[in-house]
Amino acid sequence: VLEVYYTSLRCRCVQESSVFIPRRFIDRIQILPRGNGCPRKEIIVWKKNKSIVCVDPQAEWIQRMMEVLRKRSSSTLPVPVFKRKIP
């Protein structure tokens, strides 16, 4: 599931990883657009064990995964992309 989040917490990522994370370990992918005090786009993978990983937006695997998820969401049920802020 892809989610676009707008939060009040400046940048959440300091270090980003390009290491592949298998889909079976992923609960959700958050995309934080530039702005809100953070000058760059951030991609945060929530793993099923509740740990999170900041992923390099340029990593090929995350780009491919997001493209697959976008295509799947546009051709099936309601689009699982949410704009939400955790207060």
């Epitope: 917490l9 999170i52 955790i86």
Partner: antibody, heavy 123, light 111 residues
């Protein structure tokens, strides 16, 4: 506005089960990334994390208390609860419910707290 | 478990003083380039209040005289100019590893 309010008996007998409820407002317990938990503070002492529960019902417990503790939630009532069994005088404390910030999952912090409720264990 | 040791346990200071409280973790609380160390203030009969998160980020609404620094195992909370309302007990907390653990507290008293 985020608010948390603890409720429960102020006095519990030794060997019985302590039951507390926290009623929340200003957020939903089912929102992705949301976690809530319990912390206690014995008289004149420091803070001790007891347990927390995530939006998807995943539960985390302090190993020192795990055998006696159960945390649960009722999303429809905006409530979550703590049960601590086989209590002794050492469980006398102020019990706080709190909301996790919701940014880093298992590496988060307590951003909002209830005002606390005093529980005394005595016969 | 990660043990958190605060020093001093108590401290007497005057309004206007600069005060530093330290917290040492028994192992590193850093991950992803972030220090998962947080500071709370507690006044008598009240719940703790979040002051600083991620070692140095000031919580919204907290006065700028509070600041945090450090990484790895050694952290400090600094109050640049003590105000009357700052006399309280301060706790550090780590969340890098379960179980989340707190320091024993530092009681800041009026000299």
């Amino acid at each position: 506005q985020v608010q948390l309010q603890e409720s429960g008996p102020g006095l519990v007998k030794p060997s019985e089960t302590l039951s507390l409820t926290c009623t929340v407002s200003g957020f939903s317990l089912s929102t992705f990334g949301m976690g809530v938990g319990w912390i206690r503070q014995p008289p004149g002492k420091g803070l001790e994390w007891i347990a927390h529960i995530w939006w998807d019902d995943d539960r985390r417990y302090n190993p020192a208390l795990k055998s006696r503790v159960t945390i649960s939630k009722d999303t429809s009532k905006n409530q979550f609860s703590l049960k601590l069994s086989s209590v002794t005088a050492a469980d006398t404390a102020v019990y706080y419910c709190a909301r996790i910030a919701g940014y880093y999952g298992s590496r988060d912090w307590f951003a909002y707290w209830g005002q606390g409720t005093t529980v005394t264990v005595s016969s | 478990d990660i043990q958190m040791t605060q020093s001093p346990s108590s401290l007497s200071a005057s309004v206007g003083d600069r005060v530093t409280i330290t917290c040492r973790a028994s192992e590193s609380v850093d991950n992803m380039g972030i220090s998962f160390m947080h500071w709370y203030q507690q006044k008598p009969g009240k719940a703790p209040k979040l002051l600083i998160f991620r070692a140095s980020d000031l919580e919204s609404g907290v006065p700028s005289r509070f600041s945090g620094s450090g990484s790895g195992t050694d952290f400090t909370l600094t109050i640049s100019s003590l105000q009357p309302e700052d006399f309280a007990t301060y706790y550090c907390q780590q969340s890098n590893k379960d179980p989340w653990t707190f320091g024993q507290g530092t009681k800041l008293e009026i000299k």
